[in-house]
Interface confidence: medium
């Protein structure tokens, strides 16, 4: 049995930040699991990990330099990525592994989410001319 994952096909990070929600066909309540987000068609870069078990608080971390946070739902994990760069525009895949209770479960590969990071465009301030001189 494989867990099914649903993701938005595309997200745009206008302010260099984005919320990517991974929705699972599995209830994570009172489970030990490892949810992760991977970058690239080959999922080569593990962007962020959310790990939960019975003995400690939810752990959220990145070993690849991404600024990430995670929030747990009954059947979802939402990854909040900040400080994204334009060159990090790519396809991102959600992955889930459930370690306890047995049996070990993981997911069918999802279709992924294209995250399009738009650069910050600084608009010049309008000019306010001083008092007009005769």
């Amino acid at each position: 049995n494989k867990i099914l994952v649903k993701q938005s096909p595309m997200l745009v990070a206008y302010d260099n930040a984005v919320n990517l929600s991974c929705k699972y066909s599995y209830n994570l309540f009172s489970r030990e699991f490892r949810a992760s987000l991977h970058k690239g068609l080959d999922s080569a870069v593990e962007v962020c990990v959310v790990y939960g078990n019975y003995s400690q608080q939810l752990q959220v971390y990145s070993k690849t330099g991404f600024n990430c946070d995670g929030k747990l739902g009954n059947e979802s994990v939402t990854f909040y990525l900040q400080n994204l760069y334009v060159n990090q525009t790519d396809i991102y895949f959600c992955k889930i592994e459930v370690m306890y209770p047995p049996p070990y479960l993981d997911n069918e590969k999802s279709n992924g989410t294209i995250i399009h990071v738009k650069g910050k465009h600084l608009c010049p301030s309008p000019l306010f001319p001083g008092p007009s001189k005769p």
Epitope: L28, S30, R31, N53, Y54, S55, Q56, L58, L72, G73
Partner: nanobody, 120 residues
Framework: EVQLLESGGGLVQPGGSLRLSCAAS????????MSWARQAPGKGLEWVSW????????FYADSVFGRFTISRDNSKNTLYLQMNSLRAEDTAVYYC?????????????RGQGTLVTVSS
């Protein structure tokens, strides 16, 4: 001293409803995550539901999803579990527990429990 006192259990027919309450004292209730768990005769402890301190985020076990609703009144230091469409398999002792971390984790204190019997 932390105290959790459950009430509202009893005998109910299949398809019926009950509302459990848990009166909390001895700690700052409005900053504590709380849970309901249950233990059926001859079985292990099963987590039923969890609610974060502000009361916004909630979690439910598959077995009760859509039938049970966890809520809290921080002004009254009280936790609730509204149980609808009760089934025979919901028969158990229900425990209120303080869950200091998140919905996946154990508890540090729990009450003595209240018995819910679903039978015709």
């Amino acid at each position: 001293e932390v105290q959790l006192l459950e009430s509202g259990g009893g005998l109910v027919q299949p398809g019926g409803s009950l509302r459990l309450s848990c009166a909390a004292s001895g700690f700052t209730f409005d900053s504590a995550n709380m849970s309901w768990a249950r233990q059926a005769p001859g079985k292990g402890l099963e987590w039923v539901s969890w609610i974060e301190a502000p009361g916004v985020q909630t979690f439910y076990a598959d077995s009760v999803f859509g039938r049970f609703t966890i809520s809290r009144d921080n002004s009254k230091n009280t936790l609730y579990l509204q149980m609808n469409s009760l089934r025979a398999e919901d028969t158990a002792v229900y425990y209120c527990a303080r869950s200091p971390f998140g919905p996946l984790y154990g508890f540090d204190y729990r009450g003595q429990g209240t018995l819910v019997t679903v039978s015709s």
